[in-house]
């Protein structure tokens, strides 16, 4: 009382930091700093982030909240998790689509667009790896189909004459009836 020396940050508990004259307790996640504390080891005046803004971490200095990102509809993105006061919108791809990064060194914050997953069934192939972070990995042809060029061709139902070697190996059993 009545002194002129600003106190050191030797406040009880953690999360105090010098803001101007005094050591202040910071604001919790989801809140921004309206005004610093007015006395040693005091609480800063913190307000909840307005709608469509957020702050993910406790902080001493943010006087405004960050704007929530909007998912890029042009890139076929959808919101997997809506923005809250403590977390940004999490954008991703809807089921049946996968993330295609727009940069070579891909990290979580990299720009991306969504691509439809390959439908292995429509290609008459086994699904080897389901589509999620990358495109579907299709395997060998389904039963009743054989490899021909890049695709799977349906086994013939008539004579073996029109059935090449690979076809015969896969489809030969059909001709026993």
């Amino acid at each position: 009382q009545g002194g002129t020396r600003s106190p050191r940050c030797d406040c009880a508990g953690d999360f105090h930091k010098k803001i101007g004259l005094f050591c202040c307790r910071g604001c919790p996640a989801g809140h921004y700093l309206k005004a610093p504390c007015t006395e040693p080891c005091g609480n800063s005046t913190c307000l909840v982030c307005p709608q469509d803004t957020f702050l993910a971490w406790e902080n001493h200095h943010n006087s405004e909240c960050a704007r929530c990102q909007a998912c890029d509809e042009q890139a076929s993105q959808v919101a997997l998790e809506n923005c809250s006061a403590v977390a940004d919108t999490r954008c991703g791809c809807k089921p049946g689509w996968f993330v295609e990064c727009q940069v070579s060194q891909c990290v979580s914050s990299s720009p991306f667009y969504c691509q439809p997953c390959l439908d292995c069934g429509a290609l008459h192939r086994h699904t080897r790896l389901l589509c999620s972070r990358r495109d579907t990995d299709c395997g060998t042809c389904l039963p009743g189909f054989y490899e021909h060029g890049d695709g799977c061709v349906s086994c013939p139902t008539s004579t073996l004459g029109s059935c090449p070697e690979r076809c015969a190996a896969v489809c030969g059993w059909r001709q026993m009836f």
Partner: antibody
Framework: EVQLVESGGGSVQPGGSLRLSCAAS????????MSWVRQAPGKGLEWISY????????YYADSVKGQFTISRDNAKNSLYLQMNSLRAEDTAVYYC?????????WGQGTLVTVSS | DIVMTQSPSSLSASVGDRVTITCQAS??????LSWYQQKPGKAPKLLIS???NLETGVPSRFSGSGSGTDFTFTISSLQPEDIATYYC?????????FGQGTRLEIK
Amino acid sequence: EVQLVESGGGSVQPGGSLRLSCAASGFTFSSYGMSWVRQAPGKGLEWISYISSSGGHTYYADSVKGQFTISRDNAKNSLYLQMNSLRAEDTAVYYCARGSGSFDYWGQGTLVTVSS
Amino acid sequence: DIVMTQSPSSLSASVGDRVTITCQASQDISNYLSWYQQKPGKAPKLLISDASNLETGVPSRFSGSGSGTDFTFTISSLQPEDIATYYCQQYDNLPITFGQGTRLEIK
């Protein structure tokens, strides 16, 4: 609109006393630290005292310690400066200012003249 | 106490000129520095806080920079209404202290 209006200034003889008031409006007074800053005629600005938002912490410049007392009444949105044993060198315009360090709003000032 | 040394104490410049005022603290004050404008017979007005943060409503021709002990205040293009005395002020430590002021005049 934030407003700070000082009153209580005037002429006083050396050794006399005055009580300055600062009426605050347009903001939540009880959330802010407040200061008194003075300016002698033709001179620069001198911070003299600070009080925390609750009134629980007060600080003074060495030049006025033991002579001036800062106080506040949050119910009345008012800040005060009790000035005793006034000397000629206390002649100045006295401003109340809002903030805990950086002063974003100031009153218009009240002139205190100490002269025999 | 932290001593704030402002220079120059006065300066004369023409409309449109770039004007620079410096402020030096006697010890490290981080970025806890404000700049004020005071016109004759009026209360000071806060222009810049935290060394470089322009207050709402203050024209963008005013700017501040610096950290530690050396700070600069700049008016990029002097206007007639900028004629005033300018003060720096530290709030890193009590007692709060001001520079002695810089009186700005038009040539």
